[in-house]
């Protein structure tokens, strides 16, 4: 019996009846055994078939077998109800071998030409299975030439049988206080040949409660307890189960904080498995009662281990724990059923004693010394000499613990000195220097430091003066001896002030004319304002209307008098403003250089002379009365003039202050 070629040679070929294409003889029996490599099968088809037809092919036939199974018995030329001819059919071996048997009986009624067939080996697709047959692989089947292999979805591993996918379902640890766990793929059928271990591990003090929910379906046996698949629950105290079948197990109160759930499956069956919802409980803590003026959040029916609550105080109250104020308070329930910290109190906010107001006072409106939430205080400034800047002085103790004005300001109000007050009432023109009386020129400042000079008080900690008067001390401000509140130059009774810093106008050039002859002295302390010490006002925008030609200004100082000596008593002189062109012309002739009088200067005095400021008056204020506000303001600063004070046809020259308002305001606001 001829065999097919041995692999790895190519497995293919031709078979034919003896004598083909001629007629076959009687009493012939021929057998072929074809063998393909493992993982392959044999395919066979006929190109010619002409055998004697007989009932059930008893006479002549070709029989195809694979192993013990007969694939076909063939005869005739065409199939009938009871006999089969191959026609265009293709035949496949069941395994890797195919037996072909040809037989003819003792006679033929007419000549028959037999058959011709061709065969070849081809790969078996093991992944293709007939309907109703078990799949080759659990999850994924991969065919290849000569064989196949199986693989698994994520979360599974191929069993050693190379076909089944076992679930990777161990090592899951549940640490939340409640949760759900189920068999793999639930509610679809669970995997075969798997061993799953789940752990619930809660903090000590918790007790796990297990509830089986929805459905329960684990392969069982009518006589033996869970021999195939089973679920077991283990705690440090006891074991529950095994469980199988279709009935939901009852709730399990484990009284343990750790639970191990084991689920084992065998190689067969088609069951949906189980689902567990677990919760936990613990010894409850005492119900928290909110302190007066406070509330608890969140509100719960009970509080157990790890539960927490916070206390929030009503507006105007703050948390106090024993002795200490707290920003926030949260207590946590412990495993022994006690809270980890004691309940705080909600104490009314106390803004504390209000700050003292310089040059002012504070009055308790709500009640003597009451400084708690919603208490009201009233600040006021010392009358006559101070006025409150910006707000009305009413402050309320707010929930943030700050005294707050009606405008929402947390800073103190400011008592600003009233400027330009004088005891002097202006009368008709006074010819010649006059002795000043107390309170006439309360802004007058005496500056000693090498030479005698003057200045005018601005606010309560600045002095306006001439640059040339303090130029030598610009780098040694502390050398300036500043006196105020006195009329007598040599009197021991005066208010002493000291300089913190000297600011000379950047446009002033010493010994090169007197343009920008202006300076500010910052005092190192505020002075107390009274009838003898009051600041002069700075000119308003409208002030020029009170400083036109022939308008009267007043200069004061301790400078040289007609007798040629420094005045012992403060003197003053009322002098008219001189037309600017007229003044410019007066100082055009030698010994004065051209352009001595600039637009930053104003002139005052009598054409006939006799009334003037003089050496020692430098830096003092030339003041004017603002008839609308009834306050005195500084229009000029004593700067320079003719060598002979009070000379006819010559005038006193003063720094024009209104030109320097921005400079003054910038210095004061910056420093």
């Amino acid at each position: 019996t001829p065999l097919g070629p041995k692999w790895p040679e190519p497995v293919f070929g031709r078979l034919a009846s003896p004598g083909f294409p001629g007629e076959y003889a009687n009493d012939q029996e021929r057998r072929w055994t074809l063998t393909a490599p493992p993982g392959y099968r044999l395919r066979l088809y006929f190109t010619h078939f002409d055998l004697e037809l007989s009932h059930l092919c008893e006479y002549d036939f070709v029989k195809l077998s694979s192993g013990a199974k007969v694939l076909a018995t063939l005869c005739g030329q065409e199939s009938t109800d009871t006999e089969r001819a191959p026609g265009k059919d293709t035949f496949y071996s069941l395994g890797s071998s195919l037996d072909i048997t040809f037989r003819s009986d003792y006679s033929n009624e007419k000549p028959f030409t037999g058959f011709e067939a061709f065969y070849a080996a081809e790969d078996i697709d093991e992944c293709q299975v007939a309907p109703g047959e078990a799949p080759t692989c659990d999850h994924h089947c991969h065919n290849h030439l000569g064989g196949f292999y199986c693989s698994c979805r994520a979360g599974y591993v191929l069993h050693r049988n190379k076909r089944t996918c076992s679930a990777l379902c161990s090592g899951q640890v549940f640490t939340q206080r409640s949760g759900e766990l189920s068999s793999p793929e639930y509610p679809r059928p669970y995997p075969k040949l798997s061993s799953c271990t789940y752990s619930i591990s809660l903090e000590e003090g918790f007790s796990v409660i297990l509830d089986f929910v929805e459905s329960f379906d684990v392969e069982t046996h009518p006589e033996t307890l869970c021999p195939y698949d089973f679920l077991k629950i283990q705690t440090d105290r006891e074991e529950h189960g095994p469980f199988c079948g279709k009935t939901l197990p009852h709730r399990i109160e484990t009284k343990s904080n750790t639970v191990t759930i084991t689920f084992v499956t065998d190689e067969s069956g088609d069951h949906t498995g189980w689902k567990i919802h677990y919760t936990s409980t613990a010894q409850p803590c005492p119900y928290p009662m909110a302190p007066p003026n406070g509330h608890v959040s969140p509100v719960q029916a009970k509080y157990i281990l790890k539960d927490s609550f916070s206390i929030f105080c009503e507006t105007g109250y703050e948390l106090l724990q024993g002795h200490l104020p707290l920003k926030s308070f949260t207590a946590v329930c412990q495993k022994d059923g006690s809270w980890d910290r004691p309940m705080p109190a909600c104490s009314i906010v106390d803004c504390g004693p209000p700050d003292d107001l310089p040059s002012g006072r504070v009055e308790y409106i709500t009640g003597p010394g009451v400084t708690t939430y919603k208490a009201v205080i009233q600040y006021s400034c010392e009358e006559t000499f101070y006025t409150m800047k910006v707000n009305d002085g009413k402050y309320v103790c707010e929930a943030d613990g700050f005294w707050t004005s009606s405008k929402g300001e947390k800073s103190l109000p400011v008592c600003e000195p009233v400027c330009g007050l004088s005891a002097r009432t202006t009368g008709g023109r006074i010819y010649g220097g006059q002795k000043a009386k107390p309170g006439d020129f309360p802004w007058q400042v005496l500056i000693l430091g090498g030479t005698t000079a003057a200045g005018a008080l601005l606010y309560d900690n600045w002095v306006l003066t001439a640059a040339h008067a303090v130029y030598e001390q610009k780098h040694d401000a502390s050398a300036l001896d500043i006196r105020m509140g006195t009329l007598k130059r040599l009197s021991p009774h005066y208010t002493q002030a000291w300089s913190e810093a000297v600011f000379i106008h950047e446009g002033y050039t010493h010994d090169a004319g007197f343009d920008n002859d202006i300076a500010l002295i910052k005092l190192n302390n505020k002075v107390v304002i009274n009838s003898n010490i009051t600041p002069i006002c700075l000119p308003r925008k409208e002030a020029e209307s009170f400083m036109r030609t022939d308008d009267i200004g007043t200069a004061s100082g301790w400078g040289l008098t007609q007798r040629g000596f420094l005045a012992r008593n403060l003197m003053y002189v009322d002098i008219p403003i001189v037309d600017h062109q007229k003044c410019t012309a007066a100082y055009e002739k030698p010994p004065y250089p051209r352009g001595s009088v600039t637009a930053n200067m104003l002139c005052a005095g009598l054409e006939s002379g006799g009334k003037d400021s003089c050496r020692g008056d430098s830096g003092g204020a030339l003041v004017f009365l603002d008839s609308e506000t009834e306050r005195w303001f500084v229009g000029g600063i004593v700067s320079w003039g003719s060598m002979n004070c009070g000379e006819a046809g010559q005038y006193g020259v003063y720094t024009k202050v209104i030109n320097y308002i921005p400079w003054i305001e910038n210095i004061i606001s910056d420093f």
Epitope: H323, P325, G352
Partner: antibody
Framework: EVQLQQSGPGLVKPSQTLSLTCAIS??????????WDWIRQSPSRGLEWLGR?????????DYAISVKSRITINADTSRNQFSLQLNSVTPEDTAVYYC????????????WGQGTLVTVSS | QPGLTQPPSVSVSPGQTARITCSRD??????VSWYQQKPGQSPVVVMY???KRPSGIPERFSGSNSGNTATLTISGTQAMDEADYYC??????????FGGGTKLTVL
């Protein structure tokens, strides 16, 4: 205005007990708005809070963990003063010791004694 | 609890703004006080509850506290402000804890 006047020895031998007293004027030791603290200061440890006593319908004490096993703070209402006792001292306890008032509304140490330099040396 | 962390020194020119920091994890959850100590003197509280000035402390002192850092700010610093500054808070066990101190130098 609250004033605190400290008294006590400036030199203590190792292993002995350091004792200081603080007399209060301008407030009461049993005030419900105050606590009475001891704080020490040394170059090596800076400012170190040691403990306090305060009255809220009964007397309470809080102590720093570092000295808890050997510190006692007591109040004497009849004399309006409070005291510090620190047992088993070592040279490490050498410091300037301050008695201090803290305010329950502010949580701050708002009045301090003049300070007592205590040297632990044999 | 560990102490509070402060820079050892801060320098500032007169009139400028000085900022002294104090840090610890979640310090913003606590109230912070600040103390000024001049040589040979007892400390004086200059700020409490993060941003509140005791009566008599100049308005140029201000405070803030959020996250992990509290800050004491001195605007328009003066020569008289030269001193050691300490921050202080209360930890959860109601124990007082101080910073190591910052030496403020006014140049």
């Amino acid at each position: 205005e609250v004033q605190l006047q400290q008294s006590g020895p400036g030199l203590v031998k190792p292993s002995q007990t350091l004792s200081l007293t603080c007399a209060i004027s301008g407030d009461s030791v049993s005030s419900k708005r105050a606590a009475w603290d001891w704080i020490r200061q040394s170059p090596s440890r800076g400012l170190e809070w040691l403990g306090r006593t305060y009255y809220r319908s009964k007397w309470f004490n809080d102590y720093a963990i570092s000295v808890k096993s050997r510190i006692t703070i007591n109040a004497d209402t009849s004399r309006n003063q409070f005291s510090l006792q620190l047992n088993s001292v070592t040279p490490e306890d050498t410091a300037v010791y301050y008695c201090v008032k803290s305010n329950s509304g502010t949580g701050a140490f708002d009045s301090w004694g003049q300070g007592t330099l205590v040297t632990v040396s044999s | 609890q560990p102490g509070l962390t402060q820079p050892p020194s801060v320098s500032v020119s007169p009139g400028q703004t000085a900022r002294i920091t104090c840090s610890r994890d979640k310090l913003g959850d606590k109230y912070v006080s600040w103390y000024q100590q001049k040589p040979g003197q007892s400390p004086v509280v200059v700020m409490y509850k993060d941003n509140k000035r005791p009566s008599g402390i100049p308005e140029r002192f201000s405070g803030s506290n959020s996250g992990n850092t509290a800050t004491l700010t001195i605007s328009g610093t003066q020569a008289m402000d030269e001193a050691d500054y300490y921050c202080q808070a209360w930890d959860s066990s109601t124990a007082g804890v101080f910073g190591g101190g910052t030496k403020l130098t006014v140049l």
